[in-house]
């Protein structure tokens, strides 16, 4: 025998208290598929979360983060504070990237500069807190008198003069 609840469309639930009638989801609840026996409570975007898409009878609300924060986790389950480029978020707040590392985003951690010499290349543009090193052609590729290319950095490459 076919389950009578299978006829209940999205936006309704199969109400066992009422002879399995397909009752509309109450306000602030939804069912995104048919045949549901309950409606799910709508997500509420409060505090540091803000509403990106309102809840409806057939779909949950979607949240993003207020300015100065960014989403983390599936479906923006958390909001994390933004930092400036050249910084990373620590337990004590936003801290500048250490020498030899960079972060070109408002989120995430500082990453080490690329070590050009591992690929047999030279440093074309020095790294900063905000930008990675730009590697140039390998020294062997340099034609004589090609003075426009920065010479290989000293042994402590990647090179970044202290600020």
């Amino acid at each position: 025998l076919q389950d009578p609840c299978s006829n209940c469309p999205a936006g309704t639930f199969c109400d066992n208290n009422r002879n399995q009638i397909c009752s509309p989801c109450p306000p602030n609840s939804f069912s995104s598929a048919g045949g549901q026996r309950t409606c799910d409570i709508c997500r509420q975007c409060k505090g540091v979360f803000r509403t990106r898409k309102e809840c409806s009878s057939t779909s949950n609300a979607e949240c993003d983060c207020t300015p100065g924060f960014h989403c983390l986790g599936a479906g923006c389950s958390m909001c994390e504070q933004d930092c400036k480029q050249g910084q990373e978020l620590t337990k004590k707040g936003c801290k500048d990237c250490c020498f030899g590392t960079f972060n070109d985003q408002k989120r995430g951690i500082c990453r080490p500069w690329t070590n050009c010499s591992l690929d047999g290349k030279s440093v074309l543009v020095n790294g900063t807190k905000e930008r990675d090193v730009v590697c140039g052609p390998s020294p062997a590729d340099l034609s004589p008198g090609a003075s426009s290319v920065t010479p290989p950095a000293p042994a402590r490459e990647p090179g970044h003069s202290p600020q």
Epitope: P9, S23, P24, C25, P26, S56, S57
Partner: antibody, heavy 120, light 109 residues
């Protein structure tokens, strides 16, 4: 907005089909079209509603069974009330209303109504 | 059958009065109750939904309360434009659950 049409004078035992055309929004799982009537000098009486999406689930007052049927044409964004075996006591203004999930399924939008008179 | 009973059926009041109308359901409907205002020759206007939420554009002098079987509509300070008939409605779908109340006519004292 909602606009009802199809009302008029009909003899007892006769039939009538009322229409309600919606504009500015579409019926959906969040907006159910409903019919309500009001006899002269009397209170409001709920007739029924129909699921606003593609399913044909209807919610009807018990007294309507066999005589009144609600249907919908989503392509025309129009809902209908088919009334059969009409009686003098069915004389009333018939309102079309939008029952909205966003308003706790309350009727947040109403048509002006169409008068149905059942008389010989 | 499910029923909603309003009281009083009519009342006379003056501008500035506090007016209270009650609505009793024959079985529990949680907070699924709406209140409407209707003036002669016009369709009803939604005032309150989910028992206590003010509908868009409705003045704050209107308020609703209650849950289960007993509900109240209050007009804190009656204004000239508030003389009308008021109806409660269960918005609990199915099994005849969407009945309207019997109505309360508010007239000038």
């Amino acid at each position: 907005q909602l606009v009802e049409s199809g009302g008029g004078l009909v003899q007892p035992g006769g039939s009538l089909r009322l229409s309600c055309a919606a504009s500015g929004f579409s019926f959906s799982a969040n907006y159910y079209p409903c019919w309500v009537r009001q006899a002269p000098g009397k209170g409001l009486e709920w007739i029924g509603c129909i699921y606003g999406g593609s399913s044909d689930i209807t919610y009807d007052a018990n007294w309507t069974k066999g005589r009144f049927t609600i249907s919908r044409d989503n392509s025309k964004n129009t809902v209908y009330l088919q009334m059969n075996s009409l009686r003098a006591e069915d004389t009333a203004v018939y309102f079309c209303a939008r029952s909205a999930w966003y308003s706790g399924w309350g009727g947040d939008l109403w048509g002006p109504g169409t008068l149905v008179t059942v008389s010989s | 059958d499910f029923q909603l009973t309003q009281s009083p059926s009519s009342l006379s009041a003056s501008v500035g009065d506090r007016v209270t109308i009650t609505c009793q359901a024959s079985q529990s409907i949680s907070n699924r109750l709406a209140w409407y205002q209707q003036k002669p020759g016009k369709p009803p206007k939604l005032l309150i939904y989910s028992a206590s939420t003010l509908a868009s554009g409705v003045p704050s002098r209107f308020s609703g309360s209650g849950s289960g079987t007993d509900f109240t509509l209050t007009i804190s300070s009656l204004q000239p434009e508030d003389f009308a008939t008021y109806y409660c409605q269960s918005t609990y779908y199915g099994n005849d659950g969407n009945a309207f109340g019997t109505g309360t006519k508010v007239t000038v004292k």
